[in-house]
């Protein structure tokens, strides 16, 4: 008896964070014997979506031509081959951007900032929103969520970072969202530009909090330290 | 609990100028921006513009450029208007208000009545 | 600029009776207005924002609703102590601005 079918590969290009109105596309890879790739939908009728095989049969695309709300979401795949339904694959959190107001981000006291020293970034919204997002571009695990406790909205969110190193330098946006739905974010706030100063021979920051630091900097770029300042917020890394 | 305490009522001479403070209390100063709002005689309000202490970035109604300059002092929690050129167009009650995130006005001060009178 | 044209400019009503104030802004500000209390001799007090949302400890007896460029304002069973000039504002866009405001007064 064969064991069970591998499981396939799921992804969105260009990426799984989408602005609203734009298009994306999800692939589906599985094996050269895949008869039919069906994708689902987490709190959706399954299927979403069937699709046959695009040749040489190892894979199946299916289309999103204009991005909005409905399509944010969780999504798996399968795939059928002549002895059944393979594994579903890890899912894919498709992301959709544009869905409120964009934020604010600001530095204090300043984006210039010295190493060794403290900044917060400091992300404000005009809408009332329960969870405060910040980005670091080109970091390999990029966001910090600051999230309220039991659903309160706040129009802002501190991030506190301290000591800053040479690591903590790059570009920074954040976005805003509601609880109900993680999938649907902000516009994103205007970039913020953090510019350190100082030793190039900083030690790393040195958490106060379990956060794992055994990746790379890039893998850990963000390392605030302290409370959240009486703002009814939880802080969540990813 | 949140309070802003504005200083008091100022009499003023045509061209002269002035300041007036909004001390705020019971919140973290530096990461809330400060309102600064206008209140002429027979008048509704108008917005002059706003400060963000924690980094001093500003924003001013065009309305208001070259008459009003913000400051802020985190050491003492207080903001500051500065009002120059005065003349009779700019008697009227300047309030401070503490905005929530970019959003609405939640604190207000009680006002600092301005007279210019020679 | 938006500008807020706030209606009535002044209303007397009864004690226990109901009043609706409306603002209609010159494009849509995405439920981004609040609505302020101004009694004399003080500074204004936040009553709704995001055009629904009921300040803490402000009584149920204030409401507000509307959508786009359409917002209203309502005040039922009426007490002694809602006279005052009331405002909405709207902060859809870097320049706040102030409706005109309504005097309320008890008949």
């Known amino acids: 008896q064969a064991g069970p079918l591998p499981k396939p590969t799921l992804w969105a290009e260009p990426g799984s964070v989408i602005s609203w109105g734009n298009s994306v596309t999800i692939w589906c890879q599985g094996t050269l014997e895949a008869r039919e790739y069906r994708l689902d939908k987490e709190e959706s009728p399954a299927p979403w979506d069937r699709q046959n095989p695009l040749e040489p049969k190892n894979k199946a695309r299916f289309s999103i031509p204009s991005m909005t709300e409905d399509y944010a979401g969780r999504y798996r795949c399968y795939y059928r081959s002549p002895v059944g339904w393979s594994q579903p694959s890890d899912p894919l959190e498709l992301v959709m951007t544009g869905a409120y107001s964009k934020p604010t981000l600001s530095a204090l006291p300043s984006p210039l900032v010295t190493s060794g020293k403290s900044v917060t970034l400091l992300c404000q919204s005009r809408s009332p929103m329960d969870t405060f997002l910040l980005i670091k571009e080109r970091a390999a695990h990029p966001l910090l969520h600051l999230r309220s406790e039991h659903g309160a909205q706040q129009h802002q969110a501190e991030f506190p970072m301290s000591p800053v190193t040479s690591v903590h330098g790059g570009t920074y946006r954040c976005f805003s969202s509601h609880g109900f739905s993680h999938y649907l974010l902000s516009h994103p706030s205007d970039p913020l530009e953090l510019i350190v100063s100082g030793s190039l021979e900083d030690p790393r920051p040195s958490p106060t909090r379990s956060v794992s630091t055994a990746a790379g900097p890039e893998d850990q770029p963000l390392m605030p330290t302290g409370s959240v300042p009486h703002s009814g917020l939880r802080r969540h890394w990813e | 609990q949140v309070q802003m305490q504005q200083s008091g009522t100022e009499l003023m001479k045509p061209g002269a100028s002035m300041k007036i403070s909004c001390k705020a209390t019971?919140?973290?100063?530096?990461?809330?921006?400060i309102q600064w709002i206008k209140q002429r005689p027979g008048h509704g309000l108008e917005w002059i513009g706003e400060?963000?202490?924690?980094?001093?970035?500003?924003n001013y109604n065009e309305n208001f450029k070259g008459k009003a300059t913000f400051s802020a002092d985190t050491s003492s929690n207080t903001a500051y208007i500065h009002l120059s050129s005065l003349t009779s167009e700019d008697s009227a009650v300047f309030y401070c208000?503490?905005?929530?995130?970019?959003?609405?006005?939640?604190?207000w001060g009680q006002g600092t009545t301005l007279t210019v009178s020679s | 600029d938006i500008q807020m044209t706030q209606s009535p400019s002044s209303l007397s009503a009864s004690l226990g009776g109901k009043v609706t104030i409306t603002c209609e802004a010159s494009?849509?500000?995405?439920?981004?207005i609040d609505w302020y209390q101004h009694q004399p001799g003080r500074g204004p007090s936040l009553l709704i924002h995001?055009?629904?949302i009921l300040q803490p400890g402000i009584p149920s007896r204030f409401s507000g609703s509307g959508s786009g460029r359409d917002y209203s304002f309502s005040i039922t069973s009426l007490e002694p102590e809602d006279i005052a000039t009331y405002y909405c504002l709207q902060y859809d866009n870097l320049l706040p601005t102030f409706g005109g405001g309504t005097k309320l007064e008890i008949k």
């Open positions: 995001y055009a629904s």
């Open positions: 400060i963000l202490p924690g980094s001093g970035t500003t």
């Open positions: 208000a503490r905005r929530l995130g970019r959003g609405p006005f939640d604190y």
């Open positions: 019971g919140y973290t100063f530096s990461t809330y921006w």
């Open positions: 494009q849509d500000i995405n439920k981004h």
